[in-house]
């Protein structure tokens, strides 16, 4: 499939101009290669009318130009003084016309309306409101006022001052007669339909002295805004329908066959199953505007989207709408990463999150998608040293491996951790990705004691048993804190006896704390990694108490206390609503507020990512 994208249809009127934008992946080769606009010939081929290398056909001389915008991967063709001869099938493309790096565009130039003299033209968007003003003279002030629509050769009454309303306009039309000072009456039509377009005649009086005024109503279907996003990336649809529908239910739908528009999400709580875990509808502003964020873009997400307002929460005739044509570029700059990561209860997952490598200094985040109402994504961790209180000791965001990827590790998994998580940064909003964590049957691979108590001034040895499957991995112990997990020295104690059917390659690696102090209290992780890529981890909480009896403590698996369940939500809890997710520039303000609240919270971490493969939780 060609990665070039543009408008499928362009409609205009004789004498007018059009501006056609075509999108291409902004690789260095594409940025510098020839751009062209060609017309498809009746006998094959596509004949260049204008190109970026200076060619302008005689047909276009003096009325067209082509401008390349390499920095954002677009080029624009402007054509002026359109005639009906310009109607036809075109392509915009890159390179050589016959090579297929192009997009088909249909240009339709229609004749301008043949209007009667003194005709007032009203041009209004579909679903909006029009007010047709009708002046009259004093002698007709007390006479019947009416509005007719020309249907073929005959005028058909639409509304009049005696109370008649044509059934096609019921519930959406009114006739207002201004105060005595103004010789004017108005007809207001709401929820305009395409079928309302046409020639109207308003009239005051019914005899030969009546006052008449012609009006031409043009109802415009909104031209879709072109949106070009990368596979696996993110898109935001900003929908501003105006304050008059501020209190009406809003929706985003995707056009399927014909005129059908399947609801993707609406403010009445409906959400299409295909978008579970990867969509947020941001709360409306007072003016009725709202936005919808979709992450983890798939090929099948491409198409025409409409946002609108209607009490049913779905598209109906007369809904005010905005339109987008979404193209999903399969030559994506966003790398593949797992869309599903599996872990076992008590075990861990390590999730890789991609980010735009040009933004290595950006703040990284990880949030948990919640589907209630319109969806939201409260933050769990960031790269600035903040971790949500109940995730202390079991969640860490690491800048490794770097160069476009960061890692999030979550351990002590429970069934409540199953769900969708988003990776994001305060930089490029297109690089939001989604991953689903699934909790499956099984036992954790790493075996550690539960809670451990150390004695002040003594030595503590904590074991971690690694099965033979991790023989080629680097094994480590580290102390968790809000900025990550600081590596500690550990000892290889030889083969472990903790595994059945496991040979000499299993390992027991111990952490030794000499002369324990109060500062040693906290969470410790043992884990495996290969270079900068992290695998499974297991966590142990070490408590420190006063000396009771002399000697060192060597903790075994059998003596371990039960691990504590999740901590309850405390006052340090922080959540950034979807508004911040939708516009990460808001993070800075939210963070400043949060920092003052969360100083007791002392924890730091990060965000998660997605693609088309699945990844197990135990290793990479």
């Amino acid at each position: 499939k060609s990665p070039i994208f543009g408008p499928e249809e362009v409609n205009s009127v004789e004498g007018n101009s059009v501006s056609i934008t075509c999108y291409y992946p902004p690789t260095s080769v594409n940025r510098h290669t020839r751009k062209y606009w060609c017309r498809q010939g009746a006998r094959g081929g596509c004949i260049t009318l204008i190109s970026s290398e200076g060619y302008v056909s005689s047909k276009y001389a003096g009325r067209a130009n082509l401008t390349n915008f390499p920095e954002n991967g677009t080029f624009v063709v402007n054509i002026a003084q359109l005639s009906q001869d310009d109607s036809g099938r075109y392509k915009c493309g890159l390179g050589i016309n016959s090579r297929g790096l192009s997009f088909d565009v249909s240009l339709e130039v229609s004749q301008g309306p043949g209007l009667l003299n003194d005709t007032k033209v009203y041009t209004v968007d579909l679903g909006r409101t029009v007010t047709i003003n009708c002046p009259f003279k004093t002698e007709n002030a007390q006479k019947r006022k009416s509005l007719y629509k020309q249907i073929g050769l005959y005028p058909v009454l639409v509304i009049d001052s005696s109370g008649y309303v044509n059934p096609n306009y019921t519930g959406r039309i009114r006739l207002d007669i201004q105060g005595t000072g103004q010789l004017l009456f108005s007809v207001v039509i709401n929820q305009l339909r395409l079928s309302d377009a046409g020639q109207y005649l308003c009239q005051a009086g019914d005899d030969s002295n009546s006052n008449k005024k012609n009006a031409d109503l043009q109802v415009l279907k909104p031209e879709p805004e072109l949106v070009y996003e990368d596979l696996r990336g993110s898109v935001t649809f900003h929908c501003a329908l105006g304050p008059e529908v501020a209190n009406v239910a809003k929706f985003l739908c995707r056009q399927s066959s014909g005129e059908n528009c399947d609801v993707v999400v609406n403010t009445l709580g409906k959400r299409a199953p295909a978008f579970e875990g990867r969509i947020l509808l941001n709360p409306q502003d007072k003016d009725g505007s709202f936005s919808v964020v979709i992450t983890g873009l798939r090929k099948e997400d491409a198409g025409r989207y409409l946002c609108g307002a209607h009490s049913d929460g779905q598209l109906q005739e007369g809904s005010p709408i905005q339109a987008w044509q979404l193209f999903v570029n399969e030559e994506s700059t966003i790398p593949r990463s797992p869309t599903v990561v599996k872990g076992v209860a008590g075990g861990s997952v390590a999730v890789l999150c991609p980010y735009n490598r040009k933004e290595s200094k950006s703040i990284k985040y990880w949030c948990l998608w919640e589907g209630a109402q319109n969806g939201r994504c409260p933050l769990l961790v960031d790269s600035e040293g903040w971790v949500k209180a109940q995730y202390e000791g079991r969640l860490s965001l690491l800048e490794e491996p770097g160069n476009g990827t960061f890692t999030v590790i979550l351990n002590q998994l429970t069934s409540r951790d199953a769900g969708f998580y988003w990776c994001l940064t305060n930089g490029d909003t297109l690089w939001r990705t989604t991953v689903e964590i699934k909790i499956i049957e099984g036992e954790p691979n790493l075996k550690v004691p539960g809670n451990v108590t150390a004695v002040l001034g003594e030595t503590l040895k904590v074991p971690c048993h690694f099965p033979c499957k991790f023989s080629s991995y680097e094994k480590y112990w580290c102390k968790w804190n809000n900025t990550g997990c600081q590596a500690l020295p550990s000892q290889d104690e030889g083969p472990s006896k903790a595994f059945v059917n496991c040979d000499e390659n299993s390992r027991l690696v111990s952490l030794t704390l000499n002369l324990v102090t109060r500062a040693d209290e906290g969470w410790y992780w043992c884990g495996v990694k290969q270079g900068h890529f992290y695998g499974e981890t297991a966590a142990v909480y070490v408590a420190v108490e006063e000396r009771k009896a002399a000697g060192s403590r060597d903790v075994s698996l059998a003596k371990a206390d039960a691990a504590p369940d999740e901590k309850v939500l405390d006052s340090g809890f922080r959540e950034i609503e979807n508004k911040a997710i939708q516009d990460p520039r808001l993070f800075a303000e939210e963070k400043a507020v949060a920092d003052t609240r969360d100083q007791a919270d002392g924890s730091r971490a990060s965000v998660d990512s997605g693609s088309s493969e699945e990844q197990g939780g135990s290793s990479r």
Partner: nanobody, 129 residues
Framework: EVQLVESGGGLVQPGGSLRLSCAAS????????IGWFRQAPGKEREGVSC????????YYADSVKGRFTISRDNAKNTVYLQMNSLKPEDTAVYYC??????????????????????WGQGTQVTVSS
Amino acid sequence: EVQLVESGGGLVQPGGSLRLSCAASGFTLDYYDIGWFRQAPGKEREGVSCTSSSDGSTYYADSVKGRFTISRDNAKNTVYLQMNSLKPEDTAVYYCATTFGDACTVVAGIPDQYDFGSWGQGTQVTVSS
């Protein structure tokens, strides 16, 4: 093998005439629009003339209008460029090339060189006293 061969070039004095021929082998020219191009030393290749296969219409660059005439003889599978009143600035290598059957008409002139598929090897025309 599909081939275009130009001939008829040479040295001529200003005001003189030459007739260039473009003979096709391996395919018939009557389906294609044919263009003549030229390239002077150190300059870009430029379109000179184009003849349409669909309606026989002909198109010329402003610099040669009224002096050059393009014609075709489908029976001989050849296209000609008659060049009169030659000027020193007409000195160049002249090439003929084929394009889609309605290209000249679509652009109402000489199509972009990128739209031409098969090209001849060129014939040198030198106008000098």
